[in-house]
């Protein structure tokens, strides 16, 4: 049903919504503060453009008595049970932040007659692609794929002459969140990626991932993974690798690779590590301080939320238009704007765009070094080394399938 | 980042032992690898003994069958334990660690093996 919205005579307000479930187990007063810092930049850029406006946020939290797994797989409900309150408290403001989990945005989205803007830190998976009035700032799924994809096809850089056509995916089930819907996307068999590919499998115990390290009679030599170093040195351990194994490491949002003195543990060598490139300041910035390297982008996402809506709000008040409009609702795409560490890029269905780091492991030096950069907006691959040190013969990446000639 | 302190070192006969001690600021079992290095005077840093937590030990040559590296992950303490020293061990002995992401050295201790 209709819900009144606080978003009008000159006082706008924004609904943040603070589950119990949540992508990441970041304590809400992190994202609150990020959230108030977001608030006074937007105050200032509003009063700079000569705008005598008043911007607030009223922070909505869960009861949590019934919903309390603190992570994603009770969301679902916990998300409508919030908006109902709203609902009930007549406090809808003219955009909602939040909620993270896939299954919540998703079910919040089917659910409710949205006639304004949602902006998530979150719902990665591919069942919130392509929604009219939600928009992504973390990385979805369907970026990562169209990365993968567009990597296994290219055949023409120096360090890699062969396409790839098939992969093992290692997807054991204790994933955080942001892996559980990469990977479940890689796993669809209706995906993209399944579909380029000619041949991938999964790997759901650690003694299957274990053995292919050094099966003769492997599909492929490629296995794609998501989680940090450690998550990888647990499964793996000391054990030998065969030396045409390539294994690819999806960690997105982990700044620590580009930190000062990092040296890559020798189990790193077989393996590229695909990050987001960190933002110019952010790991220095007052913002971050309090954060750990993986928590960054989440908290930094709740603040880029609310200077994207004070950026949509600058355009509207500016043009003379209604914030309380579906135009409104359906604008938080198919723009740039200026984000807490730079210009942030939203693709047509509202997504953020961003550039995906391939890193390797120098055999020379122990330091992870940067073999490529993605722009997910063009889908388009840009080489940085182009003489990398890698382990691989002949310092190229194998092929895919052993024994096979050259594409 | 982790750190690193060493002791035990001293002066020891040729053919005598030491027992050297290397305590962590945090949980050893969370670490990556844990090693002992040594560095004679006028001499390359090398290897002695390393131990990763997945349960790989590694010997230089010159030390097999004579030294023993071990953990105690209560006390998240690594030891060596060296027998039989001849001069040739003669050196300051490093404690190193490194967590998945960082190299920590210790400041090291003095060994002297002489008559």
């Known amino acids: 049903s209709q819900v009144s919205q606080n978003c009008h005579n000159g006082s706008y307000e924004i609904s943040v919504l603070m589950m119990g479930n949540s992508a990441f187990a970041e304590p809400l007063k992190n994202l609150e503060d990020a959230v108030n810092e977001g608030l006074e930049i937007v105050r200032g850029r509003l009063q700079n453009a000569g705008l005598n406006v008043t911007v607030n946020a009223t922070f909505m939290y869960s009861d949590g008595l019934i919903h309390n797994s603190g992570d994603c797989r009770s969301s679902t409900c916990e998300g409508l049970d919030l908006l109902r309150k709203i609902s009930n408290a007549q406090r809808m403001g003219c955009v909602l932040i939040g909620p993270s989990c896939t299954y919540s945005t998703f079910q919040m989205y089917l659910d409710t007659e949205l006639s304004y803007p949602m902006i998530s830190a979150g719902s990665f998976g591919l069942s919130c692609d392509y929604k009219e009035t939600l928009t992504r700032l973390m990385s979805p799924a369907r970026k990562l794929m169209y990365f993968l994809v567009n990597f296994w096809k290219t055949n023409d850089l120096p360090f890699k002459t062969y396409s790839w056509s098939t992969s093992y995916v290692y997807k054991n089930g204790t994933e955080t969140e942001d892996c559980f819907w990469y990977l479940n996307a890689l796993e669809a068999s209706v995906s993209y990626f399944s579909h380029e590919l000619g041949f991938k499998v999964v790997l759901r115990q650690d003694k299957e991932f274990q053995d292919i390290l050094m099966d003769h009679n492997r599909k492929s030599n490629v296995i794609i993974m998501c989680g940090g170093p450690e998550f990888l040195y647990k499964l793996k351990g000391d054990r030998a690798v065969a030396e045409d194994i390539v294994i690819i490491l999806v960690d997105l949002f982990n700044d620590q690779y580009f930190e000062d003195n990092v040296t890559a543990p020798d189990y790193m060598k077989n393996v590229l590590v695909l990050t987001l490139s960190p933002g110019n300041s952010l790991l220095n910035s007052s913002f971050s301080r309090n954060l750990s390297p993986t928590k960054r982008d989440f908290a930094l996402a709740y603040l880029n939320g609310i200077l994207l809506f004070g950026h949509m709000l600058k355009i509207f008040l500016e043009n003379g238009e209604n914030i309380t409009t579906p135009k409104f609702a359906h604008a938080f795409r198919n723009l740039t704007f200026e984000g807490y560490d730079g210009p942030v890029t939203l693709d047509d269905w509202g997504d953020v765009d961003s550039t995906m780091v391939l890193l390797y492991t120098s055999v020379d030096t122990k330091k992870y070094k940067v073999l490529l950069t993605y722009d997910t907006h063009v889908n388009k691959t840009y080489p940085v080394d182009m003489s990398p040190t890698f382990t691989w013969k002949n310092s190229k990446l194998p092929n895919d399938i052993t024994g096979r000639g050259p594409q | 980042e982790v750190q690193l302190v060493e002791s035990g070192g001293g002066l020891v006969q040729p053919g005598g032992s030491l027992r050297l001690s290397c305590a962590a600021s945090r949980n050893i079992f969370s670490l990556y690898r844990v090693d002992w290095y040594r560095q004679a005077p006028g001499k390359q840093r090398e290897l002695v003994a390393g131990?990763?937590?997945?349960?790989?030990?590694t010997y230089a040559d010159a030390v097999k069958g004579r030294f023993t590296i071990s953990t105690d992950n209560v006390k998240d303490t690594v030891y060596l334990q060296m027998n039989s020293l001849t001069p040739e061990d003669t050196a300051v002995y490093y404690c190193h660690a490194h967590d998945h992401w960082r190299d920590s050295w210790g400041q090291g201790t003095q060994v002297t093996v002489s008559s």
């Open positions: 131990s990763t937590s997945g349960g790989t030990t």
